[in-house]
Amino acid sequence: SERCDDWGLDTMRQIQVFEDEPARIKCPLFEHFLKFNYSTAHSAGLTLIWYWTRQDRDLEEPINFRLPENRISKEKDVLWFRPTLLNDTGNYTCMLRNTTYCSKVAFPLEVVQKDSCFNSPMKLPVHKLYIEYGIQRITCPNVDGYFPSSVKPTITWYMGCYKIQNFNNVIPEGMNLSFLIAFISNNGNYTCVVTYPENGRTFHLTRTLTVKVVGSPKNAVPPVIHSPNDHVVYEKEPGEELLIPCTVYFSFLMDSRNEVWWTIDGKKPDDIPIDVTINESISHSRTEDETRTQILSIKKVTSEDLKRSYVCHARSAKGEVAKAATVKQKVPAPRYTVEGGGGTGGLNDIFEAQKIEWHEGGGHHHHHHHHHH
């Protein structure tokens, strides 16, 4: 056979469909690989050919379009299953060709089973709703093109095993599910089942998505630096380890990039000739507000290092903030001796207790335990 532009196996399009449901799969050539659409190709005399390789087989075989009730058919650039069977799983290839031109791409199709509560290995899209934000809707996804607009399907919405009816704040409205006000308790998996008739048969389309209730933009604030702050002084002797945590709270913001970084004397730590390590940990609240902690660590600090300026910076779509840490060189405690006693006096014990960090304005000593991640 003559040469064909082979785009290989398009694993980016890991198509999953439910067993015993209709599926319409567009040839990816026109979506991602070629600069013209099917209509143009067809009018230029190009033919679209489909074939497949069964799961765990190497043999390419033609697709059987002569099955009872036209279970598998092709319409323009779409391969139709009415409905799918479990053993339809495999790699499907669509090839566009004429005598002088050939281009093909393969993609994996996985037919998956679901249980009566709609649990399955299907990867679920996530839809984020703002907490206590007013009416928000989700729409039953990927049902376009399955039936003409003249057909009026029935749509039933479920949360897990349970039909959504009589819920306090969630109302099914056809293809939409309206959340009058979203709370944390609305987190979970929501399923729409679309039932429609076609040629005397009844088909079901099942679509599940995950709803995640997140912080509202009404409550969003610029980043808040909790540490360093004006109350903590990092007082060290040369040779000791200097550990300064930068802890920043970020409100949830859709598609915002949250950043935390240190500067030392106005430069990035990488640009300073000292041995600095920075460890970052990230935690999230239930509404996806984020707390980032970056611990700046200098194993053996020098007198010069203790004179430098250490500034924590944070940025989100809401703004940028910065806070300097108060770093000081510890003044050696004077040695007091008691005449004839030969021991150190009580003052020396107090100085010994005044270790590492101290809080200004108060007499409380805090021992900070930093966990590296």
Epitope: D115, S116, C117, N119, M159, G160, C161, Y162, K163, I164, Q165, N166, F167, N168, N169, V170, S185, N186, G188, N189
Partner: antibody
Framework: QVQLVQSGAEVKKPGSSVKVSCKAS????????IQWVRQAPGQGLEWMGY????????DYAQKFQGRVTITADESTSTAYMELSSLRSEDTAVYYC???????????????WGQGTLVTVSS | EIVMTQSPATLSVSPGERATLSCRAS??????LAWYQQKPGQAPRLLIY???TRATGIPARFSGSGSGTEFTLTISSLQSEDFAVYYC?????????FGQGTKVEIK
């Protein structure tokens, strides 16, 4: 460990109503459903309905529509089943049951209350 | 609604013997079937769900099989504590329905 504790036995007159409570301890953060099932003396199990306390959703078996009301008080983790227009054939042990989440297929009757005997007699 | 029919109504078995209980659905329930055990004066206890998966803490002598409309609960070697009433339940379609029960008694 999740437990369901039900209210005590009741004796009721025909035509009256009964309200049985079911208190959950050790409730998880995730929404769950409380089911109500009854069992007449020497008979099998009969599903009556459910409620999802944190979301308010409920449904009743067709047979009990109009006579049963299932409610819940989230603040006390307590569900209630009220049956009205009682007749002698409503004499039964009434059970509440629940699963851990709304998603566990086949495990929606994982944990059971001890049962409440309701006797309807004139 | 789906009607669940259990047979036999009563099964007389000697301790140590095998017991086989049947449950039939009036229409296919796939594998969406559970089995419960109930002893006198107690609440039912979940034994099997998904037709064949043992619930937490259920001994291996209990096993379930079947799909569609025909299901079986097998107790491989009856212990004294296994004499009870057993119910099947379908959760494929609302309303969820129970069988009328099979009483397993000492022979």
């Amino acid at each position: 460990q999740v437990q369901l504790v039900q209210s005590g036995a009741e004796v009721k007159k025909p035509g009256s109503s009964v309200k049985v409570s079911c208190k959950a301890s050790g409730s998880p953060a995730e929404p769950y459903a409380i089911q109500w099932v009854r069992q007449a003396p020497g008979q099998g199990l009969e599903w009556m309905g459910y409620i999802i306390p944190s979301l308010g959703g409920y449904d009743y078996a067709q047979k009990f529509q109009g006579r049963v009301t299932i409610t819940a008080d989230e603040s006390t983790s307590t569900a209630y089943m009220e049956l009205s227009s009682l007749r002698s054939e409503d004499t039964a042990v009434y059970y509440c049951a629940r699963g851990q989440t709304l998603y566990e297929t086949g495990r929606q009757f994982d944990i059971w209350g001890q049962g409440t005997l309701v006797t309807v007699s004139s | 609604e789906i009607v669940m029919t259990q047979s036999p109504a009563t099964l007389s078995v000697s301790p140590g013997e095998r017991a086989t209980l049947s449950c039939r659905a009036s229409q296919s329930v796939s594998s969406n079937l559970a089995w419960y055990q109930q002893k006198p004066g107690q609440a039912p206890r979940l034994l099997i769900y998904g037709a064949s998966t043992r619930a937490t803490g259920i001994p291996a002598r209990f096993s379930g099989s079947g799909s569609g409309t025909e299901f079986t609960l097998t107790i491989s070697s009856l212990q004294s504590e296994d004499f009870a009433v057993y119910y099947c339940q379908q959760y494929n379609n609302w309303p969820w329905t129970f069988g009328q029960g099979t009483k397993v008694e000492i022979k």
